[in-house]
Interface confidence: low
Amino acid sequence: EAYKSEIAHRYNDLGEEHFRGLVLVAFSQYLQQCPFEDHVKLAKEVTEFAKACAAEESGANCDKSLHTLFGDKLCTVASLRDKYGDMADCCEKQEPDRNECFLAHKDDNPGFPPLVAPEPDALCAAFQDNEQLFLGKYLYEIARRHPYFYAPELLYYAQQYKGVFAECCQAADKAACLGPKIEALREKVLLSSAKERFKCASLQKFGDRAFKAWSVARLSQRFPKADFAEISKVVTDLTKVHKECCHGDLLECADDRADLAKYMCENQDSISTKLKECCDKPVLEKSQCLAEVERDELPGDLPSLAADFVEDKEVCKNYQEAKDVFLGTFLYEYARRHPEYSVSLLLRLAKEYEATLEKCCATDDPPTCYAKVLDEFKPLVDEPQNLVKTNCELFEKLGEYGFQNALLVRYTKKAPQVSTPTLVEVSRKLGKVGTKCCKKPESERMSCAEDFLSVVLNRLCVLHEKTPVSERVTKCCSESLVNRRPCFSGLEVDETYVPKEFNAETFTFHADLCTLPEAEKQVKKQTALVELLKHKPKATDEQLKTVMGDFGAFVEKCCAAENKEGCFSEEGPKLVAAAQAALV
């Protein structure tokens, strides 16, 4: 259906509150450096304009495309050239090039300081004084730090955030109530951001086909009772939703996501028995609930895969006459039977099956050639299983911090050219896989671990793409989405690396270290560990253990000293000298 005014259509569909929130998010993701007040003003003006168009669709400019309207609005920002440099050149372009230009300037690592919450009393006063402004600030702060955040999901988290304050600001001990709830929400938000960045990277770097394959596997695991037609329909719609959000079309994305939730709820009988509770909720909670819904039980009478994919004499005909449908069916049938496999593994198996058919269907006797194809999957399945087993054992032995350090050493040796902050950030996140997945039952471990690793390694790829320094990282990131993790796992020590010159400044510490929260203290120590390795890449695990132990003792000693700063300036150089001697 064609609408006279696209902006009026979206305003009517989404309602004023969600419309305004999404516009604020869109602007904050594009112009990440602008102050909150400027964005509030822009969002207010766009919302007022949309409201006017909803009342009179043939009003002036109401027929313009959303990209034109939003782009024109962004280009009115006075400080564009000062704050964003060459991003201002985007305004010289016409649509759709102008929007593509804005998208290309999104910064995945804007370097804003971490959000520090003020005192609970001040927070509650701000919340009670102007709830709308308070939640707008939350949307703004998250959106500018995470320019690819899944916008409709951010509206949901803002609603959760509101709920936390509504509850905790009434509590006797506000701090005790707010602390754990805000932290739990923070963890969810960070994971959500990373997951959506992975989806956007899949679409942008590897195309619709890669994203659709990923989604077919995931949804077939979750909804094994749904038939392939139903899975295909949901995947097609879901692809459109994520393409829109990744492309900055947040109003269309949120609207289409709501439509998809509506469709799933209207057709739950042919999708999953687990959707009922979700479908009774309002739109934001409904979509979120559907995205997180538990797996349905497998149908009891699933026949062997071999009948259709190995034993059937028509396999090559089926494959050659409609390759994507046939491979999609294979992926669907395999995934619904294997909820315990990671999506990445399922996609590798489908790729292996495809390669086998490409080879075998060109021979004189295809059935003999592909007869053992399912047996040939074994090494592909064993590899992540063994990896998870080995790493979970290491995690259980070392704990999260120790496991992070082991990964830090491993990854610094693989790619020592990568910047220290990136190596620390990524290794710390990789280390969290232990806490997140190793306590799960055997049947859920691989899926949890490998799919989480894919999301974290995507962060490494995104950061590295901004300033590429390692050919091997570029290779692992760009050759194959499903083989990224095995590619990184397979990297050995980079023998071509020339050690970094020693810089005493890097290993100089001050008394402010003592007052840092535990996590930030760990980051400081881990930064030193990476720098040490870049200086002495041949250091053994034993040597590093000794030096890190000494370093921990040094920090403890100086933080307990009467004259902390004096202790750091006196003992620090001694520690560095001892470390250098130990690592010869």
Partner: nanobody
Framework: EVQLLESGGGLVQPGGSLRLSCAAS????????VAWFRQAPGKEREFVAG????????YYADSVKGRFTISRDNSKNTLYLQMNSLRPEDTAVYYC???????????????????WGQGTLVTVSS
């Protein structure tokens, strides 16, 4: 749920023709892999012809290739089997079977089809 209802069977002389129909309800037939099977007295049920779900790719048993044609009319939600040059050995009860899903595979394994019609009798005799 898919309900299937066959019609068009009857008595025909060798060399003659018949057209079987299978009306589907409860699901669009173009999104369903559908097939015709037959069962002669005292014999196993056997695959005759099939057509994929979401793709018009057809399959035939060697014994009927060149004589039988499977097709569907999406607007009428109906599957057809045009049978020409009929032989006495084609005598059997013909069943329509459905396997929902946009899959081009029309398996020849009867057990893989969850939905079946009640059958229509075809007798080829002089």
């Amino acid at each position: 749920e898919v309900q299937l209802l066959e019609s068009g069977g009857g008595l025909v002389q060798p060399g003659g023709s018949l057209r079987l129909s299978c009306a589907a309800s409860g699901r669009y037939i173009d999104e369903t892999a559908v097939a015709w099977f037959r069962q002669a007295p005292g014999k196993e049920r056997e695959f005759v012809a099939g057509i994929g779900g979401g793709v018009d790719i057809t399959y035939y048993a060697d014994s009927v290739k060149g004589r039988f044609t499977i097709s569907r009319d999406n607007s009428k939600n109906t599957l057809y089997l045009q049978m020409n040059s009929l032989r006495p050995e084609d005598t059997a009860v013909y069943y329509c079977a459905a396997r929902p899903g946009r899959q081009l595979i029309t398996s020849k394994v009867a057990d893989l089809y969850p939905y079946w019609g009640q059958g229509t009798l075809v007798t080829v005799s002089s």
